[in-house]
């Protein structure tokens, strides 16, 4: 058993069918000695008596908050939450594994540019009862500071006849700079709560490997005369790391007819232009990557030919 | 990417091409070590990331962009004094920082290189014969410290006597391609940051 | 004490279905992760497919996807297998197993399939 | 469909030590825990160690378990004519959720 918080503590349990359980220890937090009886959650019936209270803690019903009272007046709470491990391995019911980019991935993150700051979202069935704790730092053995705001809900969407709840959280190295080289991962700790049931997901990762840029901005056409040719002009995104001489990106564009299984054109570039023929009813999209380490290509940019 | 490139000029600079070359040779060098040794801890969440050039030189804090010089993050660095002429800096004004940076890359360069020369020696005495450095990466290596063209001493290659221990030399040599591929990703952008100056 | 009964084996023809059943009690049935495993006759022990406790999600062996499903029923304490297209190398005994450091297994059911 | 890998048979005269090695790879022993189970012909399998060295109660404590990198190995210290029956590891795959992967199975004869 350990605490949590203050008043919340995680019973760890072997669970299968059967299992014997942990006995777990309840004080009550209070000078008085006697007239000390328990209870569990909203019910009145009496588990025991005295300043302890001695449980075999095996299923949920096990669990939750237990009170010592004395004389009709509360004296403290004691939350119990249940960590299951399931034949070694600790239980991941609470959130959904996302399958990307390998399977087990429950947390996911990005960052924008170098500059420390990345977001990280999970996903879950669950709608209610349900509390997220994050914390993060770079290096585990040592750690570094890193700061984390409130996880919030971000998107719901219907995924056949199940709900589906994003969540995330946005976070900050305290002190970083955007052209250090990553020695240490950055580790990111969620805690997940639903009712009883308390699990905790890890997600280990360096900046340079979540980097994901913003779409090209200001993305425009100028046709050239006496031509079917376009040149296309775009920009940096706004959030990307400076100086863009240091950091600077490749560029993707393409070509792509109304009907998705026409043939795609794709040039690719280290400039901000770039020369391409425009078919009728045919959109121009470009989108961007890190030009010297090939983490994630940007969203597209798009605009129509016409 | 088997695909149309539009490749810029590579301008004045002349370490530019070798560098863009290095990163390219590493990278290859890397995808190769990771498939081939696919049954060793060989991709980046397996190992552990040394810097062999760690106290040794301080290419991140010399060529750090002067718009980061201002990043307080950034400035933690260690002072080193480095020798100072090379002819990636003709026909050029240089300060010494930049003469400072430059040689901190030359002295990184020549570091990796013994490292992987010693380390080869080795992989050529595996019986199995898994897996050799590309000649090319080491070629490529040579160019650019040509280009640099810094004097320095020569550091003499690492020789062992006892018998090397192959899945560690092939374990050392994953850990060893991951940081220069790091610290090819800093030179290149270093490179494209004094060309464009 | 926990106990898990099976049911539902027998001989049946290439191509055609047959549903396992395993009627679980001694236990809460609706906390706990299920298995099936097979074993050939002579052979070793195959997992064939889990289902998490309130079976939100199903994994199967890819020598069994897409014919096999494995469903429960939390109310009824009885975890399922069911099986079509079913080929001659799908004869085996069928157990199926709680999930868990110290798992419990029924008695085993044999299912042939042979023309 | 076996990942993991066990000799197909190793015997012993009664009061030898016998042992079973079981070889798996990074994503299964080398990141998940191993079991060891008995059976006997013509019963289901029973549960001789979890946990790579843990005994559930009422096996023998001449039955051990270990397991070192990628490898697991089960001992039967002063081998038993009883003890004659086939043996088979098991542990989990990292990268597939609830997914079991069983050794090959390994024969264990008690001689004379």
């Known amino acids: 058993i350990w605490e949590l918080k203050k008043d919340v503590y995680v019973v760890e349990l072997d669970w299968y069918p059967d299992a014997p359980g942990e006995m777990v220890v309840l004080t009550c937090d209070t000078p008085e000695e006697d007239g000390i009886t328990w209870t569990l959650d909203q019910s009145s019936e009496v588990l025991g008596s005295g300043k302890t209270l001695t449980i075999q803690v095996k299923e949920f019903g096990d669990a939750g908050q237990y009170t010592c009272h004395k004389g009709g007046e509360v004296l403290s709470h004691s939350l119990l939450l249940l960590h299951k491990k399931e034949d070694g391995i600790w239980s991941t019911d609470i959130l959904k594994d996302q399958k990307e980019p390998k399977n087990k991935t429950f947390l996911r993150c990005e960052a924008k540019n170098y500059s420390g700051r990345f977001t990280c979202w999970w996903l879950t069935t669950i709608s209610t009862d349900l509390t997220f704790s994050v914390k993060s730092s770079r290096g585990s053995s040592d750690p570094q500071g890193v700061t984390c705001g409130a996880a919030t809900l971000s998107a719901e969407r219907v995924r056949g006849d199940n709900k589906e709840y994003e969540y995330s959280v946005e976070c900050q190295e305290d002190s970083a700079c955007p052209a250090a080289e990553e020695s240490l991962p950055i580790e990111v700790m969620v805690d997940a709560v639903h009712k009883l049931k308390y699990e905790n997901y890890t997600s280990s990762f360096f900046i340079r490997d979540i980097i994901k840029p913003d779409p090209p901005k200001n993305l425009q056409l100028k046709p050239l005369k006496n031509s079917r040719q376009v040149e296309v002009s775009w920009e940096y995104p706004d959030t990307w790391s400076t100086p863009h001489s240091y950091f600077s990106l490749t560029f993707c564009v393409q070509v792509q007819g109304k009907s998705k299984r026409e043939k795609k054109d794709r040039v690719f570039t280290d400039k901000t232009s770039a020369t391409v023929i425009c078919r009728k009813n045919a959109s121009i999209s470009v989108r961007a990557q890190d030009r010297y380490y090939s983490s994630s290509w940007s969203e597209w940019a798009s605009v129509p030919c016409s | 990417r088997n695909l149309p490139v539009a490749t810029p000029d590579p301008g004045m600079f002349p370490c530019l091409h070798h560098s863009q070359n290095l990163l390219r040779a590493v990278s290859n060098m890397l995808q190769k070590a990771r498939q081939t040794l696919e049954f060793y801890p060989c991709t980046s969440e397996e190992i552990d990331h040394e810097d062999i050039t760690k106290d040794k030189t301080s290419t991140v804090e010399a060529c750090l962009p002067l718009e980061l010089t201002k990043n307080e993050s950034c400035l933690n660095s260690r002072e080193t004094s480095f020798i100072t002429n090379g002819s990636c800096l003709a026909s050029r004004k240089t300060s010494f920082m930049m003469a400072l940076c430059l040689s901190s890359i030359y002295e990184d360069l020549k570091m990796y290189q013994v490292e992987f020369k010693t380390m080869n020696a080795k992989l050529l005495m595996d019986p199995k014969r898994q897996i050799f450095l590309d000649q090319n990466m080491l070629a490529v290596i040579d160019e650019l410290m040509q280009a640099l063209n810094f004097n320095s001493e020569t550091v003499p290659q690492k020789s062992s006597l006892e018998e090397p221990d192959f899945y560690k030399t092939k374990i050392k040599l994953c850990i060893l391609l991951h940081a220069f591929r790091i610290r090819a990703v800093t030179i290149d952008r270093v490179m494209s940051y004094l060309n464009a100056s | 004490q926990v106990q898990l009964v099976q049911s539902g084996g027998g001989v049946v023809q290439p191509g055609r279905s047959l549903r396992l059943s395993c009627a679980a009690s001694g236990f809460t049935f609706s906390s706990y992760g299920m298995h099936w495993v097979r074993q050939a006759p002579g052979k070793g022990l195959e997992w064939v497919a889990f289902?998490?406790?309130?079976?939100?999600?199903?994994y199967y062996a890819d020598s069994v996807k897409g014919r096999f499903t494995i469903s429960r029923d939390n109310s009824k304490n009885t975890l399922y297998l069911q099986m079509k297209s079913l080929r001659a190398e799908d004869t085996a005994v069928y157990y199926c197993?709680?999930?868990?450091?110290?798992?419990?297994w029924g008695q085993g059911t044999m299912v042939t399939v042979s023309s | 469909s076996y990942v993991l890998t066990q000799p197909p048979s190793v015997s012993g005269t009664p009061g030898q030590r016998v042992t079973i090695s079981c070889s798996g790879g990074?994503?299964?022993?080398?990141?998940?825990?191993v079991k060891w189970y008995q059976q006997l012909p013509g019963t289901a399998p029973k549960l001789l160690i979890y946990g790579n060295d843990q005994r559930p109660s009422g096996v023998p404590d001449r039955f051990s378990g270990s397991k070192s990198g990628t490898s697991a190995s089960l001992a039967i210290t002063g081998v038993q004519a009883e003890d004659e029956a086939d043996y088979y590891c098991q542990s989990y795959d990292s990268s597939l959720w609830g997914t079991r992967v069983f050794g090959t199975g390994t024969k264990v004869t008690v001689l004379g």
């Open positions: 289902i998490r406790y309130d079976g939100s999600n199903k």
């Open positions: 197993t709680t999930h868990g450091s110290h798992d419990t």
């Open positions: 990074r994503s299964n022993i080398g990141s998940n825990t």
